[in-house]
Amino acid sequence: EVEKTACPSGKKAREIDESLIFYKKWELEACVDAALLATQMDRVNAIPFTYEQLDVLKHKLDELYPQGYPESVIQHLGYLFLKMSPEDIRKWNVTSLETLKALLEVNKGHEMSPQVATLIDRFVKGRGQLDKDTLDTLTAFYPGYLCSLSPEELSSVPPSSIWAVRPQDLDTCDPRQLDVLYPKARLAFQNMNGSEYFVKIQSFLGGAPTEDLKALSQQNVSMDLATFMKLRTDAVLPLTVAEVQKLLGPHVEGLKAEERHRPVRDWILRQRQDDLDTLGLGLQGGIPNGYLVLDLSMQEALS
């Protein structure tokens, strides 16, 4: 806290300008009117104030706006944003995407800080949903942003926003998140033709159910092994050898290298060995010929 002291004669600031660089902290506190600072906030970033001087300017704004800064001030914070705490930011009401972008630019190249996370949270909650432009902006600054959201939060993403998502934005998503995003992607891309559809839907397939994988197997999509390995195990298990062969096309040979890893390992255990042998890959571990397979889950459902 800076002590309240009277402003020395002739030092009262008439505008925010370079002369303030030479003011001591107590002089800034005493001689700069907070309302003047708020109206000329855009100048602060053009002046090489010390971090200590910036602390004083922030303190003045906090006193002027105890309920939170107005957007007219927020949009010109610049590097003063880095001095804000999450508690400060929770009081804000940021509605303009331009303001959000301007503040994210200041933090560019750094990890998502608690301040930025709070800012984004306030902004998205204020909008009510994660619209395409917002998602575009957030994933441009933080490619992992989407995967940092809970499935509940992801449910507010409208299907139209899915067009903004790039494959790398989904790299760190877990199956629960993809379960939410996949149906939205399916809806968003529904009017595309086969090959274009597959290119777009591919990165979301970790949330696809068995019936959709079966449908894809009929479309000569040639899914690569990396995508196949990210599929839900429970969605892969019911696929027949013929369906997996059609789904992977020329990439089917890659199954051999992955035979000890899920979901390939679990899928092999569910197939008849003679069906696996038709692939000619030397996959082992299938159900021996002559054995009867009982689907206990079906039996439980019937009883």
Epitope: D17, Q40, D42, R43, N45, A46, I47, P48, F49, Q75, H76, G78, Y79, E98, T99, K101, A102, E105, V106, N107, K108, G109
Partner: nanobody
């Protein structure tokens, strides 16, 4: 993403003038304080001038009185008018976004002043 592309540098006689330009993309130009810095070989980068989003300008000590910074928010362009150039003004001139504490930099444009 962010691109700051400087132009207008070159070789000029002592006492001559140059006008540098910087076209910005990938930033909210109208909300950013912008600036010009310079760096001569073996020297630290130094602030030449900055300009607030509203157009108010701050000039560093290095070229004060011989430079004018301006901006056109409609064209996302920053300018630096340099007059009465001296050989010691020879340096790489960099456009920056963020004002006195930049968050983004251009690649620079070389200014050489011959005596």
């Amino acid at each position: 993403q962010v691109q700051l592309v400087e132009s207008g540098g070159g070789l000029v006689q002592a006492g001559g003038s140059l006008r540098l330009s910087c076209v910005a993309s990938g930033i909210v130009f109208r909300l950013n304080a912008m600036g010009w810095f310079r760096q001569a070989p073996g020297r630290e980068r130094e602030l030449v001038a900055t300009i607030a989003s509203g157009g108010w300008a701050y000039y560093g000590d290095t070229m004060s009185g011989r430079v004018t910074i301006s901006r056109d928010n409609d064209k996302n362009t920053l300018y630096l008018e340099m007059n009465s150039l001296k050989p010691e003004d020879s340096a790489m001139y960099y456009c920056s976004a963020g004002g006195a504490r930049p968050h983004s930099w251009g690649q620079g444009t070389q200014v050489t002043v011959s005596s």
